[in-house]
């Protein structure tokens, strides 16, 4: 089973209003069942939202970054913090909310074409002296913005779903985010029982495709709550 996720190695499905309604395209991803932060409450609500410990920005949600909760606080104690909106102060790109990046210490809109080249190092994995490429990772010293007009194919590294081609979403896979296929009819999905639930996992699934919703598979109605299988079904 995948209940072996330990020590803040997984992304969260953020509760509304931070991440859209769970299981809806607004949230981009659907948590794999049973993959939870140890000791966490599978059905937490936003009211008792627990700080999520982290070591790297990549371990936080797309609308979060990893930092000490207090200015000048203990660097050893870091949690996922809400991203900074436009015109807020920042120290790195990950601090700024999707659609923005950090320029001269301020979060600014990333509409400009030159933005992507500036954050190349944050989304590609350096190979040192190894010039091979593997699954969308590549070593580059420069990165033309043109690359980002071409949407990522399945397996390409991404920051968010808008980086991916049609029919794909940006989802966590181990400790990277890559473009994965939006779920089709009959495919296994994850339905959170409450909008505020936190599924913490490193194998995220996309949401169900258009015209589909994540529902209990008919022949699983009699099964126990924990083993209920959800699949993408026609509305």
């Amino acid at each position: 089973t995948l209940n072996s996720v330990l020590n803040s190695n997984a992304i969260k499905n953020l509760p509304p209003p931070l991440g859209g309604a769970a299981g809806h395209p607004g949230s981009a991803v659907s948590a794999a069942p049973g993959i939870l932060y140890p000791g966490g409450n599978k059905y937490q609500t936003i009211d008792n939202y627990q700080p999520y410990p982290c070591a790297e920005d990549e371990e936080c949600g797309t609308d979060e970054y990893c930092a000490s909760p207090t200015r000048g606080g203990d660097a050893g104690v870091q949690i996922c913090l809400a991203c900074r909106k436009r015109r807020k102060r920042c120290m790195r790109h990950a601090m700024c909310c999707p659609g923005n990046y950090c320029k001269n210490g301020i979060c600014v809109s990333s509409d400009q074409n030159h933005f992507r080249g500036e954050i190349e190092e944050t989304i590609t994995e350096s190979f040192g002296n190894d010039h091979s490429t593997l699954d969308g990772y590549s070593r580059r010293t420069t990165l033309s913005s043109k690359m980002y007009h071409t949407k990522g194919q399945e397996g390409s590294v991404c920051l968010r779903s808008s980086d991916c081609a049609s029919g794909l979403c940006c989802a966590r896979h181990f400790w990277s985010k890559i473009c994965k296929p939006v779920l089709k009819e009959g495919q296994v999905c994850t339905k959170h029982r409450r909008k505020g639930s936190h599924g913490l996992e490193i194998f995220q699934r996309c949401y169900c495709g258009e015209g589909l919703s994540c529902r209990i598979q008919k022949d699983h109605h009699q099964a126990s709550n924990s083993s209920r299988l959800h699949t993408c079904q026609r509305h």
Partner: antibody, heavy 119, light 106 residues
């Protein structure tokens, strides 16, 4: 040259402990997720554990959960596997591997170090 | 966990033969499937990742195909250095390897 070099294997009694090390060179270790994969004598490959690039995320196979601990020291370009409460079935060659990368492949492997658990 | 079943478990072939090894997943794994070659006493080597992409430095006689549950590794013309054991590995959900296919000299 991209290289991984394991060390620390040997003979240990059941219930004993051992710490494996993997020295990395030729690539940017601090940006790479790393794993341990083992192979029992005459058997197939079994993935054991993985750790994220910064060390904040760790992940284990059910067979070793609670007994093994993966860690890394990016300043030393070294990966570790602390193995406690060893059992006879843990006897294997332990490989250090770079990955999972991208969709989850392991693209660089060490030569392996043999761990024998026997009384 | 997702089970990976390789077939055959072993095969005998001659230099120049076309060799096909199959790998079947217990559930759909999209293209999160990778192939490795291992020679006795040596570490595995990545041949193909993401079902069909040839890893750098791997000869073009190796190819991979498939998606979902059924995958194939093909060696178009077997060379003396290709006699080895081949493993598939899925990473769609956790990480599991197939049991291996030993390619021996006929």
């Amino acid at each position: 040259e991209v290289q991984l070099l394991e060390s620390g294997g040997g003979l240990v009694q059941p219930g004993g402990s051992l710490r494996l090390s993997c020295a990395a060179s030729g690539f940017t270790f601090r940006t790479s997720a790393m794993s341990w994969v083992r192979q029992a004598p005459g058997k197939g490959l079994e993935w054991v554990s993985a750790i994220s690039s910064g060390g904040g995320g760790t992940y284990y196979a059910d067979s070793v959960k609670g007994r093994f601990t993966i860690s890394r020291d990016n300043s030393k370009n070294t990966l570790y596997l602390q193995m406690n409460s060893l059992r006879a079935e843990d006897t294997a060659v332990y490989y250090c591997a770079r990955g999972p990368r991208g969709r989850g492949a392991f693209d660089v492997w060490g030569q392996g170090t043999l761990v024998t658990v026997s009384s | 966990d997702i089970q990976m079943t390789q077939s055959p478990s072993s095969l005998s072939a001659s230099v120049g033969d076309r060799v096909t090894i199959t790998c079947r997943a217990s559930q759909s794994i999209s293209t999160y499937l990778h192939w490795y070659q291992q020679k006795p006493g040596k570490a595995p080597k990545l041949l193909i990742y993401a079902a069909s992409t040839l890893h750098s430095g791997v000869p073009s006689r190796f190819s991979g195909s498939g998606s979902g549950t059924d995958f194939t590794l093909t060696i178009s013309s077997l060379q003396p250095e290709d006699f080895a054991t081949y493993y598939c590995q899925q990473s769609y959900n956790s990480i599991t390897f197939g049991g291996g296919t030993k390619v021996e000299i006929k």
